[in-house]
């Protein structure tokens, strides 16, 4: 290379060099017809109007008009890579999943890292949880472990998810990020305290994607070959070491290199610095689950490592960059309901909600046959079922095989060995209010025992620096919640807010105007 820069910057140069011996391809239309002139449209005379028969133009333009697909409603901004999972420790006593079959076994994987709230063009260095989703291409179909870089989440009931995400995204009138929305929701739902505390700690802004841990977060169920089941949590710890960005560096990078995370990952892999993560499980027996002091399926809580130690399983290694971002990263679709035999869902309400939501949003974003897209295709298993047709059916549509079941013609048969683990439930069927399921004990342990004095100081500064832009009544609700975690937590934030509030004039009222006909008489009287 004449002017050697980093591999990401030199991608086109590298592509050209790889093809140095080849003659340039013949330019074609989408249908493969050769194109004679790609620089000038057909017109009647040099200044005349265009002709509809200029299919070179219309083919190009029509395709361009349809280039964009809907961005993900959450986790829109992301980076992807490919590699393998290698088993280093035997856990077949817990799970019969083929991915864990024997030590040394390698399974191809695809990974996508992402932020959550930002749009697809947003900065990589914002304070936001990070998605860390892993797709294992196993012989029993794909296993999608759709994790984050935190072991917990803001809510424990999936009915709140749309509202939670709305509160993090843009105000419906101003189209601006709105601290009132963010903190109003968080302050009204104190189960968010654990994740909020993690988010505003030093780990809230990881240094790229290679220096953060991943967690399945939910409780799952593992089932062994004898049909015995345990509950489990998945952890994947970075072998590169945890590194975070300071608030100042993150702000600078969001200006200078908003794609910092994508660039860092691409360049590391392109230069042979393959990032890896050590994969662990925590295991809890059904008996232990009965006596666990909290609901073991509560996504706002962790399982203490001293009681449920990490059990090593294997390594995740990323050694290939995407050949094409749209094909392999934008179109990749992770779905927590993709679980091969040996791995099952627990009663975790958030997981149960995601089992529906994820494939549902993929059908909207990519179409009903999104599993035909090569990056999503379970290519190490033979797909044989009774699903047919639909938009963008991209394979042979299973040929002439019967499309109904049962049938008498030797079409795919059910496998009793793949039956789900059976479990007995009994209980009242109703909407259970979990709002007050101990929202502070584990947060207090995090604040007092996990963080040191300097980290606590930065946590409070980070929170106050964001919370200051919310209205005072919302600030008070939030501080009350933090105070319930620990008096010093709330009062430290309040001391910082006092300074902000004293120095900054506050607009106490946000304008919301509705046409008069929609207003009740009582509301009209107050105008």
């Amino acid at each position: 290379m004449a002017d050697s820069r980093d591999p990401a910057s030199d991608q086109m140069q590298h592509w050209k060099e790889q093809r140095a011996a080849q003659k340039a391809d013949v330019l074609t239309t989408g249908a493969g017809n050769p194109v004679g002139d790609k620089l000038n449209v057909i017109t009647v005379g040099p200044r005349g109007p265009l002709l509809v028969q200029d299919v070179v133009f219309t083919d190009e333009m029509a395709h361009f008009d349809r280039e964009r697909i809907p961005e993900r409603v959450v986790h829109a901004k992301g980076a992807g890579a490919f590699g393998y999972f290698e088993v280093t420790h035997d856990i077949t006593k817990y799970s019969k999943a083929k991915v864990f079959e024997h030590i040394g076994k390698k399974t191809p994987i695809a990974v996508r890292f992402s932020t959550v709230a930002g749009e697809s063009g947003s900065a990589d260095t914002v304070r936001d949880p990070r998605g860390f989703a892993v797709k294992f291409y196993t012989e029993d179909g794909n296993w999608d472990l759709v994790g984050n870089n935190t072991p917990i989440f803001f809510i424990r009931d999936p009915i709140l998810f749309p509202s939670f995400i709305h509160s993090q995204k843009r105000n419906p009138q101003t189209h601006l990020k709105d601290p009132d929305m963010v903190w109003d929701f968080w302050s009204l739902r104190p189960e968010s305290l654990h994740q909020v505390s993690f988010l505003f700690s030093d780990r809230g802004i990881p240094d790229g994607h290679r220096h953060m841990n991943g967690y399945g977060s939910h409780t799952f169920k593992l089932v062994n070959a004898n049909g015995e089941a345990v509950y489990c949590k998945f952890h994947y710890k970075t072998d590169q070491g945890i590194k975070n960005l300071s608030v100042e560096d993150a702000a600078r990078l969001s200006q200078e290199d908003p794609d910092y995370g994508i660039r860092d990952l691409f360049n590391a892999i392109a230069t042979g610095k393959y990032p890896s993560w050590t994969f662990y499980i925590q295991v809890m027996t059904f008996n232990q689950a009965e006596t666990f002091p909290f609901n073991p399926f509560d996504l706002t809580k962790v399982w203490p490592h001293k009681d449920y130690p990490l059990i090593p399983v294997g390594k995740l290694v990323l050694n290939r960059n995407p050949v094409n971002y749209f094909a392999e990263v934008e179109q990749i679709a992770f779905d927590p309901s993709n679980m091969p035999p040996g791995i099952e869902a627990s009663p975790d309400k958030m997981l149960q909600g995601r089992l529906f939501a994820y494939p549902d949003t993929h059908r909207h974003r990519l179409g009903p046959n999104y599993l035909h897209i090569p990056v999503n295709c379970p290519y190490r298993a033979r797909v044989a079922n009774y699903q047919r047709d639909g938009p963008m059916c991209m394979q042979d549509n299973q040929g002439g095989a019967p499309n109904y079941y049962p049938n008498s013609f030797g079409a795919p048969e059910q496998q009793p060995s793949a039956l789900e683990h059976s479990i007995q439930y009994s209980g009242e069927v109703r909407r259970f209010n979990t709002a007050n399921d101990d929202n502070v004990t584990q947060v207090r342990a995090f604040y007092v025992n996990v963080l040191n004095e300097e980290q606590r100081k930065r946590l409070c500064e980070n929170i106050a620096g964001h919370l200051k832009d919310a209205q005072i009544f919302i600030q008070k609700k939030a501080v009350k919640n933090f105070t319930e975690v620990h008096p010093d937590y709330g009062s430290h934030i309040q001391a910082l807010l006092d300074k902000y509030n004293a120095e900054k004039p506050k607009n106490a009222i946000h304008t919301f105007v509705q046409s008069g006909s929609h207003l009740a008489a009582r509301e009209k009287a107050n105008l």
């Epitope: 100081k457 409070c460 005072i472 600030q475 008070k476 501080v479 105070t483 008096p487 010093d488 709330g490 009062s491 430290h492 309040q494 001391a495 807010l497 006092d498 509030n501 004293a502 004039p505 506050k506």
Partner: nanobody
Amino acid sequence: EVQLVESGGGLVQPGGSLRLSCAVSGFIFNTYSMRWGRQAPGKGLEWVSSISTGGYSTYADSVKGRFTISRDNAKNLVYLQMNSLKPEDTAVYYCGWGAFVRGERPQGQGTQVTVSS
């Protein structure tokens, strides 16, 4: 009933020092941030300093480096050590708890500080 009783004010020359105290009762003292504010004649209540239960403190830029807030959680007391006093520090000083809100009314009866030669 919450009670805040400020004391320690007085007349002092420019460059001098005073130590204000605030005795607190009626709520769980070691759960809340405490603060000092002041009100000069004809002006609104101005925030001076706040302190967390653990002793973390913040200050208005006008007093930073001269004033020090502290608290004794065992005795339910808050202090404001004021050094290098200036004539513009002349005001009634009030103790407060919880959030400072611009334009609020003072919570206690206050203690007068006059800096004059």
